[in-house]
């Protein structure tokens, strides 16, 4: 059956022999409704990608360097397999290039120039691309050649299988480049026996390469690794300071009808009858004919590579920057050392027109950039489409575990001038109810709730981590009868109750009526029986300070907050009567842009802030009529973090075990590409 | 509430010159921001250009040094000058002075430029 065939690409004799045993092998084992394995011939791993692009075939194993060929239009190709080494219990898909350095040196990464360097080889992942992208915009010009320019930044180096006649000071540290292990200097522990001998002050290598070389602990004390961001850490911390993550082989197919899921179907089949140890007549990681044909012989078995996860995300903005360093030969005009203007990412068209007013009074030094829903935001700033967003709590949780930092906090309580230094202890999420309901925390089962959003503190992750550790399972739709949960599977229960309208219905946006806090108020008000917000939700919007036709004439009495112990209080008593204290919005950037969001962002509440009087004539930061676009209304100020800038600080503990708990109910895609 | 309408658009050829107005009910002297946004066929409406009550101004990559935005407030009028107009220019234009909050949509008519030889 041609759509149930998988057509692999092969690049060599060799490959193609392999590639018709893989076919023929899978052929006796599994059933004729299966998936089937067809083989391409083509001269080259590119002649594969465009093959592939053109839907001429359907598949190719490559290396982390032509993934980003195969990424960039018009191939348009995406990640939906990855290769795994070491054991099954621990997969590596990944390995770290990290920058090793000796502990009794003094230097950081933004001060190699003059040092000694020491590299795998030319042209090598971790050795070169590596390292000499990401310092690219800091080689003297002209850039090109580009081992002239490198010659010219170190003081000395050793790099095998460079031109030691054109490049002489490229072989300084080891005479003549040789290109194999005869050169004491090459490859992995070349490069990092380079640094131990002395010869070199710092050495490009895998995060593994210390400890292959280094069995005692206390030896490899002796040593540290350079951070992009200008410190140093430990060389177990590789995780947290490395100069980029680099996915080892992987499996390519189509962005858009693409048959990922026959290809991991196909593969998965294939692992269980021919992985390692499996059969003595294929073996799918070696091969009679050659090393590496199709997959690499050291892999262990494949990965599915989860379904958010793009090109960009598998690659990472530090390995898709040295890359497009070293292919475009760009840099920027002004010096690496001044802050850019910063891309605030907006939700839905609301939040952009809130973000252009912002734009123009900036003069310029903030953009926009726009996504439907927040994961796609948090994706944006990953990948250094965006480079900042306010974040609920939840969505700092999921952010953080994508690799980018809390910046700044937005504070409720405290008045200016003390507000900028000032850490808040977070605001009350709150369950609401109707003063004439008679319902409490304990008979909600079978009502119709109404939640800010699917993974936001106040609206999902308190409450329903607190049902979940009561009813034991996340089936969370068939609790309540119904509900407007935003960002809910479209046909779940939990969209029912959600007003759209219709093509943005339970999106989660301001594009949906009954989106975040004003909104799930605005549900309980008109449909549902409870509501899951911030203890300020109910006076911001009673009274008349809410002008909308839905809400200009509620009273804040008419409404009344569940306690945990199944009691009922006013809704001026949050303090006696909440689920939980949540952490407030907080500002979040990729690490690299933190300090500029901060310094940009403490100046433009100077101008914009809570300081403005009249909005009506101004422009306000902090004003959108309720809606809580790009901040909270209700923000005084953004505050400095002090040393809360991690997610785990900034969250603490108990918020963040409970949202780890509520993982087992995630229904976040990004956090599943994020973790994997 | 002050209501916008905008007027000057028509057909031009490439390289041609068009001047928008946008006209306004009441007093725009203090307000905040004005700008000028476009919508081609099945594209989202972009930021076009910006203008702030003291006179400073924001530009869209795509028209940086062809188009001049300035209000006169004395004239109660916004203005768009486009300059070495090109195809990619073709759009509805739109003029928004941000009073309404960002949340209703609360566009007007908008004026169509077409660009073609």
């Known amino acids: 059956v041609p759509e149930k065939s998988v057509r692999w690409c092969a690049v060599s004799e060799h490959e193609a022999t392999k590639c018709q045993s893989f076919r023929d092998h899978m052929k006796s084992v599994l059933p004729s409704n299966g998936p089937s394995v067809a083989c391409v011939k083509k001269a080259s791993h590119l002649d594969c990608i465009r093959a592939i692009a053109a839907n001429e075939a359907d598949a190719v194993t490559l290396d982390a360097g032509l993934v980003y060929d195969a990424y960039l239009a018009p191939n348009n190709l995406k990640p939906v397999v990855a290769e795994f080494y070491g054991s099954k219990e621990d997969p590596q898909t990944f390995y770290y290039a990290v920058a090793v350095v000796k502990k009794d040196s003094d230097f950081q990464m933004n001060q190699l120039r003059g040092r000694k360097s020491c590299h795998t080889g030319l042209g090598r992942s971790a050795g070169w691309n590596i390292p000499i992208g990401l310092l690219y915009c800091d080689l003297p010009e002209p850039r090109k050649p580009l081992e002239k320019a490198v010659a010219n930044f170190f003081s000395g180096s050793c790099v095998p299988c460079a031109d030691g006649t054109d490049f002489p000071q490229l072989c300084q540290l080891c005479p003549g480049c040789g290109c194999s292990t005869l050169n004491q200097y090459f490859s992995y522990s070349g490069a990092f026996k380079c640094l131990k001998d002395g010869a070199g002050d710092v050495a490009f290598v895998k995060h593994s390469t210390i400890f292959e070389n280094l069995a005692n602990k206390a030896d490899r004390d002796q040593y540290e690794l350079l951070c992009l961001d200008n410190t140093r850490k430990s060389v177990d911390e590789y995780k947290d300071c490395h100069l980029a993550r680099v996915p080892s082989h992987t499996v390519v197919a189509r962005s858009v009808g693409g048959k990922e899921d026959l290809i991991w179907e196909l593969l998965n089949q294939a692992q269980e009858h021919f992985g390692k140890d499996k059969s003595k007549e294929f073996q799918l990681f070696s091969s009679p004919h050659g090393k590496d044909l199709l997959f690499k012989d050291s892999a262990h078995g494949f990965l599915k590579v989860p379904p958010r996860m793009d090109a960009k995300m598998y690659l990472g903005y530090e390995y898709i920057t040295a890359i497009r360093n070293l292919r475009e030969g760009t840099c920027p005009e002004a010096p690496t050392d001044e802050c850019k203007p910063v891309k605030w990412c907006a939700l839905s068209h609301h939040e952009r027109l809130k973000c252009d007013e912002w734009s123009v009074n900036s003069a310029g030094k903030i953009e926009c950039e726009s996504a439907e829903t927040t994961e796609d935001c948090i994706a944006k700033i990953m990948n250094g489409e965006a480079d900042a967003m306010s974040l609920d709590g939840g969505f700092v949780y999921i952010a953080g575990m994508c690799g980018l930092v809390p910046v700044l906090a937005e504070n409720y309580n405290t008045p200016n001038p003390n507000c900028e230094n000032t850490a808040e202890e977070g605001y009350f999420a709150v369950a609401v109810v109707k003063s004439s309901s008679d319902l409490t925390w304990d008979n909600l089962k079978g009502k119709k709730s109404c939640h800010t959003a699917v993974g936001r503190t106040a609206g999902w992750n308190i409450p329903m981590g607190l049902l979940y550790s009561k009813i034991n399972h996340c089936r969370f739709d068939e609790f309540f009868s119904e509900g407007c949960a935003p960002g809910s599977e479209k046909n779940s229960s939990l969209c029912k109750l959600c007003m759209g309208p219709s093509p943005n219905l339970c999106e989660p946006n301001n594009k949906e009526g009954y989106y975040g806090y004003t909104g799930a108020f605005r549900c309980l008000v008109e449909k549902g029986d409870v509501a899951f917000v911030k203890h300020q939700t109910v006076p911001q919007n009673t009274g008349g300070k809410n002008p909308d036709a839905w809400a200009k004439n509620l009273k804040e009495e008419d409404y009344e907050l569940l306690c945990l112990d199944g009691s009922r209080k006013s809704v001026q008593e949050p303090a006696n009567c909440h689920l939980a204290r949540a952490p407030n919005h907080a500002v979040v950037a990729r690490k690299d842009k933190a300090d500029c969001v901060q310094t940009l962002l403490l100046d433009q509440q100077r101008m914009f802030g809570s300081s403005v009087t009249d909005c009506s004539s101004n422009f306000c930061l902090f004003e959108s009529k309720t809606k809580d676009l790009l901040f909270r209304d209700d923000t005084v100020c953004l505050a400095k973090l002090h040393d809360r800038n991690t997610y785990e600080k900034y969250l603490g503990e108990e918020y963040v075990k409970a949202v780890t708990n509520l993982r087992k109910c995630s229904t976040s895609p990004l956090l599943e590409a994020c973790t994997f | 509430e002050v209501q916008l309408v905008e007027c000057g658009g028509g057909l031009v050829q490439p390289g041609g010159s068009l001047r928008l107005s946008c006209v306004a009910s009441g007093s725009i002297a203090s307000i905040a921001t004005m700008a000028w946004y476009r919508q081609a066929p099945g594209q989202q409406r972009e930021l076009v250009a910006g203008?702030?009550?003291?006179?400073?101004?924001k530009y869209a990559d795509s028209v940086k040094g062809r188009f001049t935005i300035s209000r006169d407030n004395a004239k109660n009028t916004l203005y768009l000058q486009m300059n070495s107009l090109k195809p990619e220019d073709t759009a509805v234009y739109y003029c928004?002075?941000?009073?309404?909050?960002?949340?209703?949509?609360?566009w007007g008519q908008g004026t169509q430029v077409t660009v073609s030889s």
């Open positions: 928004t002075d941000y009073s309404r909050g960002y949340y209703q949509d609360y």
């Open positions: 203008i702030t009550r003291g006179g400073s101004t």
